[in-house]
């Protein structure tokens, strides 16, 4: 993520493109365009003769990380000779307008290349003034004014979760370690068939719905956030979140688990079949044989109505079941229905039968070339 240890931090922002700084008082935007409502402006001390003191100082770039700390860095290698430049700062037209010295310098090859300010020293909505100075040439100094609310970079979104809203709709949720209403988000998603990400802007609500999901494809989602537009107008996005994956072949992800699953299913199936067979044979032994209607008449005739003789019921039990009254014998026969077997004839295809279950839709996969 974005929160590195200090030595790394000191190098991280030296890599950002640095602007050349002129001798005249200028107002610059971060991309170098002149603008009277800039996030910062820079002044240098003009002199008549060209000497060391007229060399422009490198531009200072400040970024506020999740409003936890701020790094202000400069390109120390732009100096003609290694120089430990010093940094002072204050807040314009505020209670914090006392000039402060940097108390925590960042170094690159043992030369000062930045300053880190802690949370208590950051006031987002006051104009931050930063001054870089060459201690050997006190006249050689540069001052910049910054709107810190436009320089916030949040941490990457965390805890991405996916859940199905319906058979074909997915919802992505995430968290930010910051006041959520201050951030906007960019969601990117793709399948393994896509050669490019599809992206969607999301407001402060930190949730995203994908209305149409192909069940046969695998999806990847990632999110990044920006401090914009409600609390500031930052241009820089956070790092991307860790991606989250959803889709077809998740069961094949771990070959060991896949094999284990196959074994468990096989053993379970065999166990179930054996159990059913055992139950069947046990029932065969313990339950009386129940005749089918087809041969009931023959049995009654053959055994002269003696139920216990052919059923396997003990003589004692049979006697206890004997009624103390006589009944007429009533023969029952089944008349087969007209019209043949169930499901034959028109209108009987599986597609036309009403069922409480829906068959999944068919997908035709086409390469996106």
């Amino acid at each position: 993520m974005l929160k590195p240890s200090l030595p790394f931090t000191s190098l991280l922002f030296l890599q950002l493109p640095l602007l050349g700084v002129g001798l005249n008082t200028t107002i610059l935007t971060p991309n170098g365009n002149e603008d009277t409502t800039a996030d910062f402006f820079l002044t240098t001390m003009p002199t008549d003769s060209l000497s060391v003191s007229t060399l422009p100082l490198p531009e200072v770039q400040c970024f506020v990380f999740n409003v936890e700390y701020m790094n202000c860095t400069w390109n120390s290698s732009s100096e003609p000779q290694p120089t430990n430049l010093t940094l002072h700062y204050w807040y314009k037209n505020s209670d914090n307008d006392k000039v402060q010295k940097c108390s925590h310098y960042l170094f690159s090859e043992e030369i000062t290349s930045g300053c880190q300010l802690q949370k208590k020293e950051i006031h987002l909505y006051q104009t931050f003034v930063v001054q870089l100075q060459d201690p050997r040439e006190p006249r050689r100094q540069a001052t910049q004014m910054l709107k810190l609310q436009n320089l916030v970079i949040p941490w990457a979104p965390e805890n991405l979760t996916l859940h199905k809203l319906s058979e074909s709709q997915l919802e992505l949720n995430w968290n930010n370690r910051f006041l959520n209403h201050c951030l906007e988000h960019l969601v990117q998603y793709r399948t393994d068939w896509d050669h490019s990400w599809t992206e969607q802007s999301v407001d402060y609500r930190h949730k995203f719905s994908l209305p149409s999901v192909d069940g046969q494809k695998r999806y990847t989602f990632r999110v990044r956030s920006r401090f914009n537009p409600l609390c500031g107008s930052a241009q820089h996005w956070s790092e991307w979140s860790h991606p989250i994956h959803w889709g077809s072949n998740t069961s094949k992800e771990n070959p060991f688990l896949f094999a284990l699953e196959a074994v468990v299913i096989s053993v379970g199936s065999m166990g179930l079949i054996i159990s059913l067979l055992c139950v069947y044979f046990w029932l065969e032994r313990t339950m009386p044989r129940i005749p089918t209607l087809k041969n009931l008449e023959d049995l009654v005739t053959e055994y002269h109505g003696n139920f216990s003789a052919w059923s396997g019921v003990s003589k004692g039990l049979a006697e206890s079941l004997q009624p103390d009254y006589s009944e007429r014998l009533c023969l029952v026969s089944e008349i087969p229905p007209k019209g043949g077997a169930l499901g034959e004839g028109p209108g009987a295809s599986p597609c036309n039968q009403h069922s409480p279950y829906w068959a999944p839709p068919c997908y035709t996969l086409k390469p996106e070339t």
Epitope: D192, H195, S196, E199, N254
Partner: antibody, heavy 116, light 108 residues
Framework: EVQLVESGGGVVRPGGSLRLSCATS????????MSWVRQVPGKGLEWVSS????????DYADSVKGRFTISRDNAKRSLFLQMNSLRAEDTALYHC?????????WGQGTLVTVSS | DIQMTQSPSSLSASVGDRVTITCRAS??????LNWYQQKPGKAPKLLIY???SLQSGVPSRFSGSGSGTDFTLTISSLQPEDFATYYC??????????FGQGTRLEIK
């Protein structure tokens, strides 16, 4: 027919800069993310950078982060790679390719040589 | 970063042979695996994407399979024009996109 033609390569000293261009035709440029992939002659392929369809999202290999900038001009159907603070290890044939994640079509490449 | 390892680094085969090249990822990449062919002095050409989907215009003798960490590219009956270097590439965890070191297929 899809065509990608790179230009802008050449010999440059360490610390110098170059801007590579890739002119495209034969496909809907706006529909594709685009990438740069480099190859040291006789060696394997190394992904350098990608940009999404509208230019709003860029990704870089760690080896070039902070030194190279990818951009695109959809109106001109062109892809660019601004290379600053060049090093000897940046010497390679630079291919532009369609796609951000895998690469459907490739240009023949432009050779960048960083040497003192 | 995910490392991609191809094997073998080079192999010799004859026209008509069935050839298999394998690619192993240092962690599971699901089916986010693509294969390219590169001939000397030419740009690489996409053969297979999403592990097993044949890019349009690529002969059906090329096929890809695998999921997770182990993948194969198979050429069912080698043709003279198939002698080239083949690369696998993962697009699961990006950035960075990473390639295998390549497999050089030579005529025996």
């Amino acid at each position: 027919e899809v065509q990608l033609v790179e230009s802008g390569g050449g010999v440059v000293r360490p610390g110098g800069s170059l801007r590579l261009s890739c002119a495209t035709s034969g496909f809907t440029f706006d529909d594709y993310g685009m990438s740069w992939v480099r190859q040291v002659p006789g060696k394997g392929l190394e992904w350098v950078s990608s940009v999404n369809r509208n230019g709003g999202t860029t990704d870089y290999a760690d080896s070039v982060k902070g030194r190279f900038t990818i951009s695109r001009d959809n109106a001109k159907r062109s892809l660019f790679l601004q290379m600053n603070s060049l090093r000897a290890e940046d010497t390679a044939l630079y291919h532009c390719a369609t796609g951000e994640l895998f690469f459907d079509y490739w240009g023949q490449g432009t050779l960048v040589t960083v040497s003192s | 970063d995910i490392q991609m390892t191809q094997s073998p680094s080079s192999l010799s085969a004859s026209v008509g042979d069935r050839v298999t090249i394998t690619c192993r990822a240092s962690q599971s990449i699901s089916s986010y695996l693509n294969w390219y062919q590169q001939k000397p002095g030419k740009a690489p050409k996409l053969l297979i994407y999403a592990a097993s989907s044949l890019q349009s215009g690529v002969p059906s003798r090329f096929s890809g399979s695998g999921s997770g960490t182990d993948f194969t590219l198979t050429i069912s009956s080698l043709q003279p024009e198939d002698f080239a270097t083949y690369y696998c590439q993962q697009s699961y965890s990006t950035p960075p996109i990473t390639f295998g070191q390549g497999t050089r297929l030579e005529i025996k």
